[in-house]
């Protein structure tokens, strides 16, 4: 079964860091670009970042550029999001999603930035 | 960046109703427009990609149309499991996959 499972969320103070992971199974991970999308409490969906299948190119929303880093380890079938200099407005559920179709999504992991 | 707007932001409807949700792009996105359904506390689910192509397993009561800047998602006969929030998303300007703000469909 095709699955994505996020982990690494939690409570962090403003200015702090977190590293999210997304473990993929049931498909050939290396073939697909991967994405992070977030959803603030009670709000809509916001695309955060994408990484090409090879990992050679990465793309970011302006709101996270310079603070967040997307990466992947194709040998471990895992996607990452390193989040630095966190702000209150980064509080959200973070989803990983597969490919240009965003056809498979994880269940999400909650990141709360608060003092 | 391409901005996406949806209308209405919410609507109340009854089981069996025909519901139409509109999505507008700030510039032409061709037919690169996808629709997602999200239920409370759950991840979004792809319904329709490239304007009108129903994802495998999605009921045929869902349909999509449009091109350029104006798009619609229609549910021909609303079912209890269709009460959810619907988002459009453009995939024309890869990778800035802009989502619309969502349309919440609730029970009248």
């Amino acid at each position: 079964e095709v699955q994505l499972l996020e982990s690494g969320g939690g409570l962090v103070q403003p200015g702090g860091s977190l590293r999210l992971s997304c473990a993929a199974s049931g498909f050939t991970f290396s073939l697909y670009s991967m994405n992070w999308v977030r959803q603030a409490p009670g709000k809509g969906l916001e695309w955060v970042s994408s990484i090409y299948s090879s990992g050679g190119s990465t793309l970011y929303a302006d709101s996270v550029k310079g603070r967040f880093t997307i990466s992947r380890d194709n040998s471990k079938n895992t996607l990452y999001l390193q989040m630095n200099s966190l702000r209150a407005e980064d509080t959200a559920v973070y989803y990983c999603a597969r490919g240009r179709a965003f056809d498979i999504w994880g269940q999400g992991t909650m990141v709360t930035v608060s003092s | 960046d391409i901005q996406m707007t949806q209308s209405p932001s919410s609507l109340s409807a009854s089981v069996g109703d025909r519901v139409t949700i509109t999505c507008r792009a700030s510039q032409s996105v061709g037919t690169y427009l996808n629709w997602y359904q999200q239920k409370p506390g759950k991840a979004p689910k792809l319904l329709i990609y490239a304007t009108s192509n129903l994802r495998s397993g999605v009921p045929s009561r869902f349909s999509g149309s449009g091109s350029g800047t104006d798009f619609t998602l229609t549910i021909s006969s609303l079912q209890p499991e269709d009460f959810a929030t619907y988002y459009c998303q453009q995939s024309y300007s890869i990778p800035r996959f802009t989502f619309g703000p969502g349309t919440k469909v609730d029970i009248k």
Partner: antibody, heavy 120, light 107 residues
């Protein structure tokens, strides 16, 4: 301009070996996965092998597994296919093709092909 | 492995005709379906990827649709240069697999 140029084909006896090369130009070779596809005379297309951009991951069709080895030298912009224990059924035109570096969308640029004939 | 089946295996048509080629996957492949055109003695050429996205430079008379297991390639007004063999291919999973091809000939 994106170009892929295969070489190394020829006539070989059953059980023999050949090494195909594919010289790439006009794009940043090191960021693209690469693929070998073959086509037997008068037949359809058959995927043979795939290699990730770094060369760290490789996959093979069951029909060639254990006999063929795909590799790449990113410093030379070149893709290879080492073919051992060749059989008559390996006779085909072999194409190298560029994979999609963004997503799983199949090979977009192809070489002109090199013919491999396995016969005694 | 995912099997790809194309129909018809060949068809005869006239210039200006609208033709539809079908490709079916043995299991759901989402939108990861590509179409290629091949002319005799030439390498295949990518026409369409992700089921519906036209490769740059391909004329708009070509269109694709479908998702899951059933896909179509439509040529809306056949031109002399369109007489060729068309292959579908899934890029959903390894091994990547091609359909058997549809040869489009002049009536």
């Amino acid at each position: 301009e994106v170009q892929l140029l295969e070489s190394g084909g020829g006539l070989v006896q059953p059980g023999g070996s050949l090494r195909l090369s594919c010289a790439a130009s006009g794009f940043t070779f090191s960021v693209y996965p690469m693929i070998w596809v073959r086509q037997a005379p008068g037949k359809g297309l058959e995927w043979v092998s795939y290699i990730s951009s770094s060369g760290g991951q490789t996959w093979y069709a069951d029909s060639v597994k254990g006999r063929f080895t795909i590799s790449r030298d990113n410093s030379k912009n070149t893709l290879y296919l080492q073919m051992n224990s060749l059989r008559a059924e390996d006779t085909a035109t072999y194409y190298c093709a560029r994979g999609d570096d963004y997503d799983s969308s199949g090979p977009d640029y192809w070489g002109q092909g090199t013919l491999v004939t396995v016969s005694s | 492995d995912i099997q790809m089946t194309q129909s018809p295996s060949s068809l005869s048509a006239s210039e200006g005709d609208r033709i539809t080629l079908t490709c079916r996957a043995s299991q759901s492949i989402s939108i990861y379906l590509n179409w290629y055109q091949q002319k005799p003695g030439r390498a295949p050429k990518l026409l369409m990827y992700a089921a519906t996205t036209l490769q740059s430079g391909v004329p708009s008379r070509f269109s694709g649709s479908g998702s899951g297991t059933d896909f179509t390639l439509t040529i809306s007004g056949l031109r002399p240069e369109d007489f060729a063999t068309y292959y579908c291919q899934q890029s959903y999973d390894i091994p990547l697999t091609f359909g058997g091809g549809t040869k489009v000939e002049i009536k």
